[in-house]
């Protein structure tokens, strides 16, 4: 079967995944955006989302996930800090656009986290845990419960990369406090 395009990131425990999702700013600047994990045979699960409406360059932190939406650049920055092996899996950025189904942004991210550091002497490996200090005012947004099954079964575009790394279960520490409320009818 054809797959949606994936980009693979291989990182070590404790490091930071830092990706940027490009969107059409005229259409989606203030739309609510989310970071989701996709498990085989399941609907994507929202792990964190921006506020509604999304605020410009205002960090939203849910556990170890930090979202920043840069309206003037049409860019959603997603960081997962202090990565754990259990974080390995397939992720995607989406834009909520009720009443239509969420709009998926390219590419999906295949995250592979392994144990131990791979640094050279003198490299600042632990900086990923220290560089980004999120202010205490950081908000936790309410994430919609809504996820269309069609986001799993939609006709995929031509894949430019096939990554066959198996999915792993994920258990993101401190993410259980996401409040999920059905904000769409």
């Amino acid at each position: 079967a054809t797959k949606l395009t994936e980009e693979k990131y291989e990182l070590k425990e404790g490091q930071t995944l830092d990706v940027k999702c490009d969107y059409t700013l005229e259409k989606f600047a203030s739309s609510q955006k989310a970071w989701q994990i996709i498990r085989d045979g399941e609907m994507p699960k929202t792990l964190a989302c921006t506020e509604r409406p999304s605020k410009n360059s205002h960090p939203v932190q849910v556990g170890r996930i930090i979202l920043e939406d840069y309206h003037d650049h049409g860019l959603l920055r997603v960081r997962m800090v202090n990565l754990q092996v259990e974080d390995s899996g397939l992720y995607q950025c989406v834009i909520y656009q009720p009443p239509k189904e969420p709009h998926m942004l390219f590419d999906r991210i295949r995250l592979v986290v392994t144990k131990g550091f791979s640094g050279t002497p003198g490299s600042n490996e632990n900086s990923t845990q220290n560089v980004y200090k999120i202010p205490p005012t950081t908000t936790k947004a309410l994430c919609p419960l809504y996820t269309s099954p069609r986001t799993v079964t939609q006709a995929p575009p031509k894949s430019t990369a096939d990554v066959s790394t198996p999915d792993s279960e994920i258990n993101l520490t401190n993410v259980t406090d996401i409040i999920r409320v059905p904000v769409f009818n």
């Epitope: 395009t5 980009e7 940027k20 490009d22 700013l25 650049h73 049409g74 900086s127 575009p157």
Partner: antibody
Framework: EVQLLESGGGLVQPGGSLRLSCAAS????????MSWVRQAPGKGLEWVST????????YYADSVKGRFTISRDNSKNTLDLQMNSLRAEDTAVYYC????????????WGQGTLVTVSS | EIVMTQSPATLSVSPGERATLSCRAS??????LAWYQQKPGQAPRLLIY???TRATGIPDRFSGSGSGTEFTLTISSLQSEDFAVYYC??????????FGQGTKVEIK
């Protein structure tokens, strides 16, 4: 297979104009940002300009700002670079590059087209 | 603007030996670094991105490491086709995204 094919290079006098084009195939063109990167003879790589997948956001190096314009036609899968007020220091091989879907690095490159600015 | 500095400018290595190339950023870029290889008369080719991840089709003798401001590209056992110029590039957030000046790996 991703393919990027540049055209439009050539010899132009200082102060003149040139339009470079890049024909893209093998990927969902409108989903990815695209860039131009140049390399002066015997020198290193220099980023020139980037345009988002939708074309709504553009970025330019200070050295070309106000003189170069990047654009794209997603219906034709083409990327353009309009170069005006050309200077001798703009002489370089210009590469069309596909930006990765997750970050601003370049995962595929064209073979380049040579622009020579000389009187 | 972030300045990327590569060292050494030229590295003379015998085939089969290990090559270690360095790249330093003027400020922390986390792991937002890519490495490219360029052979004479050819376009650059992506080797490593995110400081550690090998691009599709890149042999495992190429490996990247480092984070923050100090990065390393290691070629564990140089093959004849590896003699080329190598560039690092940062992509921390928005353009401009700067390249290092390059390291030429030549046959000793």
């Amino acid at each position: 297979e991703v393919q990027l094919l540049e055209s439009g290079g050539g010899l132009v006098q200082p102060g003149g104009s040139l339009r470079l084009s890049c024909a893209a195939s093998g990927f969902t063109f409108n989903a990815y940002a695209m860039s131009w990167v140049r390399q002066a003879p015997g020198k290193g790589l220099e980023w020139v300009s980037t345009i988002s997948g939708s074309g709504s956001t553009t970025y330019y190096a200070d050295s070309v700002k106000g003189r170069f314009t990047i654009s794209r036609d997603n219906s034709k899968n083409t990327l353009d670079l309009q170069m005006n007020s050309l200077r001798a220091e703009d002489t370089a091989v210009y590469y069309c590059a596909k930006v990765a879907g997750s970050n601003f690095f370049f995962d595929h490159w064209g073979q380049g087209t040579l622009v020579t600015v000389s009187s | 603007e972030i300045v990327m500095t590569q060292s050494p400018a030229t590295l003379s290595v015998s085939p089969g030996e290990r090559a270690t190339l360095s790249c330093r950023a003027s400020q922390s870029i986390n792991a937002n670094l890519a490495w490219y290889q360029q052979k004479p008369g050819q376009a650059p080719r992506l080797l490593i991105y995110g400081a550690y991840t090998r691009a599709t089709g890149i042999p495992d003798r190429f490996s990247g490491s480092g984070s923050g401001t100090e990065f390393t590209l290691t070629i564990s056992s140089l093959q004849s086709e590896d003699f080329a110029v190598y560039y690092c590039q940062e992509f921390i957030l928005f353009p401009p995204h700067t390249f290092g000046q390059g390291t030429k790996v030549e046959i000793k």
